[in-house]
């Protein structure tokens, strides 16, 4: 038997993936555990093997289908269970009735690219990945730019309150190396959270023209 507190948190990427993390304050080092997903109104169910991510937490991804297929809707409720092997039996360690579109975390934006760069400004675009057509344009973005000598945590957040997959960064320093990241969040969902940050895009502003006042 396992004592201690347990936390079981899952997010839906809005298409065909539910990612789960299970934390348990009591050692279960050599036990095999899995997450089982059982939708209330679908003919399929799905299982994934929980793998350790730290001393007391495990994670896994429920792959529900092809990455861009709409496997769940706003009406679905999915019973999610953590099952751990005890001898020849499986024991239910945690359970939740999961409303996918109340618990969203989209995939990080992809395909970041510099559209145009000048001495003091840079236009950057990106794409969203595996996001449901349900959202229409009702998404928001946060972006940040890493300046020399600073950390990502120090970078001010720029908020885009609509589905705008580009940004024009202003007041940059000429001939300077920067990095840029963006993340996305739907407006829908009580427990929805920001996507992971995108992979950083490195870019360099153009040098100031010699002999010109910049």
């Amino acid at each position: 038997a396992v004592n201690g507190t347990s936390q079981f948190t899952c997010f839906y990427n809005s298409r065909a993936n539910i990612s789960c993390v299970w934390s348990q304050d009591g050692a279960l080092q050599d036990t095999s555990c899995q997450v089982h997903a059982w939708p209330d109104r679908r003919r399929w169910n799905q299982t994934c093997e929980l793998l350790p991510v730290s001393q007391a937490s495990w994670a896994c991804n429920l792959i529900l289908g092809a990455p861009d297929s709409q496997k769940l809707t706003t009406v679905d409720i999915v019973t999610l269970r953590v099952l751990c092997r005890e001898g020849v039996r499986w024991r239910v360690m945690a359970i939740q009735d999961f409303k996918p579109f109340e618990n969203l975390r989209l995939m990080a934006p992809i395909s970041l690219q510099v559209v145009h760069v000048e001495t003091h400004r840079c236009n950057i675009s990106w794409e969203i990945s595996q996001a449901s057509h349900y959202f229409e344009r009702h998404l928001e973005f946060e972006a940040r730019t890493l300046s020399p000598g600073h950390t990502w945590e120090e970078a001010p957040l720029l908020t885009l309150k609509q589905k705008q997959e580009w940004i024009c960064l202003e007041t940059l320093t000429p001939d300077t190396q920067y990095e840029f990241q963006v993340r996305v969040k739907p407006l829908q969902g009580e427990f929805t959270t920001w996507s992971p940050w995108s992979q950083p895009l490195a870019f360099r502003t153009k040098p100031a023209a010699l002999g010109k006042d910049t």
């Epitope: 809707t73 706003t74 349900y134 229409e136 829908q188």
Partner: antibody
């Protein structure tokens, strides 16, 4: 410009079936949800159901699911709502609308259906 | 089924004044509440989503707020074109349901 243009007014006898069309333009019909909403006199708005053209799925409100069928023809960008076994209380304006599942962003002009013997 | 109750049924306000319309849900619906405006002979028009997010193209005088299961639509300074019927709609539980409407009329 997003547009949803519905077919004209209908007069039907009790027990008959009505089929209303909703021709859309200005957006990608194949990646959209089309909803249908009833507005009966003195009864307010009632959501009837939707069709998800990308997933090929329909959802119906429990109060309508025995009598309503929502379909779509993606070759003509047209959605249809068929209501059977009509009764006098089905006399109403019926709207098609585009939206995500949660709210209705753009609406058709409405189709009046009168059920009378 | 979640019941949405709007109050008052009719609200009489003078142009230029503030109007406050209320919508209460019979159970907790988080922020899954949306507001529509309907003028006579026209289809409803979406104004506000998720309790307080304005739709682009909607004048800034329209705003929404939430306190528990009670939602409020405020029109800060009424214009002649704002006199209409206003509906709320919940999308927390299936089937989605509308309030019965508040008629905003000229005082």
């Amino acid at each position: 410009e997003v547009q949803l243009v519905q077919s004209g007014a209908e007069v039907k006898k009790p027990g008959a079936t009505v089929k209303i069309s909703c021709k859309v333009s200005g957006f990608n019909f194949k990646e959209s949800l089309i909803h249908w909403v009833q507005q009966a006199p003195g009864k307010g708005l009632e959501w009837m159901g939707w069709i998800d053209n990308e997933a090929g799925e329909t959802e119906y409100a429990p109060g309508f699911q025995d009598r309503v069928t929502i379909t779509a023809d993606t070759s003509t960008d047209t959605a249809y709502m068929e209501l059977s076994s009509l009764r006098s209380e089905d006399t109403a304006v019926y709207y098609c609308a585009r939206g995500g599942p949660w709210f209705l962003s753009y609406w058709g002009q409405g189709t009046t259906v009168t059920v009378s013997s | 089924e979640i019941v949405m109750t709007q109050s008052p049924a009719t609200l009489s306000v003078s142009p230029g004044e503030r109007a406050t319309l209320s919508c209460r849900a019979s159970q907790i619906i988080s922020n899954n509440l949306h507001w529509y405006q309907q003028k006579p002979g026209q289809a409803p028009r979406l104004l506000i989503i998720y309790g307080l997010q304005s739709i682009s193209g909607i004048p800034a005088r329209f705003s929404g707020s939430r306190s528990g299961t009670e939602f409020t639509l405020t029109i800060s300074s009424l214009q002649s074109e704002d006199f209409a019927v206003y509906f709320c709609q919940q999308s927390n539980n299936f089937p989605y349901t509308f309030g019965q409407g508040t008629k905003l009329e000229i005082k």
